[in-house]
Amino acid sequence: QDSRGCARWCPQDSSCVNATACRCNPGFSSFSEIITTPMETCDDINECATLSKVSCGKFSDCWNTEGSYDCVCSPGYEPVSGAKTFKNESENTCQDVDECQQNPRLCKSYGTCVNTLGSYTCQCLPGFKLKPEDPKLCTDVNECTSGQNPCHSSTHCLNNVGSYQCRCRPGWQPIPGSPNGPNNTVCEDVDECSSGQHQCDSSTVCFNTVGSYSCRCRPGWKPRHGIPNNQKDTVCEDMTFSTWTPPPGVHSQTLSRFFDKVQDLGRDYKPGLANNTIQSILQALDELLEAPGDLETLPRLQQHCVASHLLDGLEDVLRGLSKNLSNGLLNFSYPAGTELSLEVQKQVDRSVTLRQNQAVMQLDWNQAQKSGDPGPSVVGLVSIPGMGKLLAEAPLVLEPEKQMLLHETHQGLLQDGSPILLSDVISAFLSNNDTQNLSSPVTFTFSHRSVIPRQKVLCVFWEHGQNGCGHWATTGCSTIGTRDTSTICRCTHLSSFAVLMAHYDVQEEDPVLTVIT
């Protein structure tokens, strides 16, 4: 030690007083003012502490430093003097910074910057709110999920940026006078069916439902295989076709080919194609009967059954299809002689006459329609000369009383048995399928081959028999008059008809003719 010099052991942040004592530098303090042992330390004084005499003044913050302190303007303020730091209130020139002016994009989108002392706030635009995790950021308010239920129950709420809309639900429309979007929107169900806004296939009927619609198969139609009924995409097929198949138990390639064509037509059928489909079916039937092929090798009974099946099915199919035709008269004829005459009308109170090459039919229109059936009235007549091949040797079954009269007054059946078909086979049908007991009779005038003298001419119809086959019968049909090549028949029911020449040896005078017929 140098008694006159400086102590060399002074602790950090202190200076020697003499050779035996030290004092802490300004901004530092020790336990005692004079340090006499090297074990003591000088600690930084926090001039910014609450009890400190330092005052930086308003809008400023005190920052403690090693051995000293600085006064700085608080965030959001800046010194007018430009000096970044100062030591006391008298040197303080801090004033508020207008952050909004400094940085116009401070509140990003959807907010307006509002300057405050030392800071700023963002005021959100209508439809926005401050994000809790970032109070300076405006975010869209979802009015639809906020529990405010701003929309009428007939609408659904559509949130969009900064706003929302009350839109009609799908299948609904604004009530008259209501807007579509604002919160005062009120909607009602759209009837897609009557307004034509539906997508139903033409094979279906549109049914309106609340907010939607469905498509159901037309009466007499069924859903296509694998497609459910009552959907928007339901497509149906006419059951008339699907059930007109070869009769089980009859095996014929020609017949199978015919029914394959029928089924194909059924698969592709749409009501708008009714006219074409009718023509295609009759064309196919005409071809089948012109060249029956292996049908002619079937036993006679089976041929009669096939004829019965064809006549039956044809009537059903034509009745079904003709309901989709527009009003008017149609006539089609085919190479092998098949002929169709059809009249479609909204019901009128008059008689109708359908004329063909070999037959004329007359009946009252009011027979045509079932009461309560909304569709058009249809009267149809088909001449099918080719059916005669299949009906060759078909039996004639007379009512017991007619049979008895004939046996009593005639020589009886000649040796060669079966009656001869003189005319074309014709089939008559109406939109009304209840034709077993007409309120006024139908009249047929047949042109036919010459009658062999002294033979009995009978007006007959094809009665579909017990076993699905059939026979000729006269019940309900009477012969009004006959000439050499024409016969007038009157019947109280509809079916397939023809004129037969029975092998009875008629006497010169026929006293019971009128009774029989």
Epitope: M239, T243, W244, T245, P246, P247, P248, G249, V250, H251, S256, L301, Q302, C305, D312, D316, H464, G465, Q466, N467, G468, C469
Partner: antibody, heavy 120, light 107 residues
Framework: EVQLVESGGGLVKPGGSLRLSCAAS????????MSWVRQAPGKGLEWVST????????YYPDSVKGRFTISRDNAKNSLYLQMNSLRAEDTAVYYC?????????????WGQGTTVTVSS | DIQMTQSPSSLSASVGDRVTITCKAS??????VDWYQQKPGKAPKLLIY???NRHTGVPSRFSGSGSGTDFTLTISSLQPEDFATYYC?????????FGGGTKVEIK
Amino acid sequence: EVQLVESGGGLVKPGGSLRLSCAASGFTFSSYDMSWVRQAPGKGLEWVSTISSGGNYNYYPDSVKGRFTISRDNAKNSLYLQMNSLRAEDTAVYYCARHYDYPDYAMDYWGQGTTVTVSS
Amino acid sequence: DIQMTQSPSSLSASVGDRVTITCKASQNVRTTVDWYQQKPGKAPKLLIYLASNRHTGVPSRFSGSGSGTDFTLTISSLQPEDFATYYCLQHRNYPLTFGGGTKVEIK
């Protein structure tokens, strides 16, 4: 005495195949149309297929069309049903039956049935 | 396809009762309807063909009637051996279709 005896049933996995046979005796087999009819457990009867007496015509409902094939061997008095792409819903007792002559066409004689189970 | 709707699906009756089962076709099938009887675990047996004709060996108490769309099987006096399930079948068109069956049980 007319007799029809089915065989060939058994357990098969979905998608698998099976061939059923029906041995006929006591009548002129080649003169009659024949059919297969099935009955699912606890359910009603369902027509499966028909073949003509000569074997050249066969008929199926949509439910089996393209998967099942009916055939016959008149020399062996036998009727067959080849079943492919089997499904769980094909599980049933399968009967073969003889048809009356058309137009009557009822099934006048039936076999005792063979059981087909389609299960994984 | 032609649907055959059979009713009732089941019935309880006593020996000696007259029992009537009906079958309704979804469209005209003329008379191409047959009736079959089936006992548990056994093959069906033909009773009536073409709506009203009794098959060989079928007792006269069984009768069938109807044509077009409505058909009836009648058992005039039920016997113990008649307790079974009865089915109708149409063979007017393909596919051949059976009714759902009527189970006749002992009361």
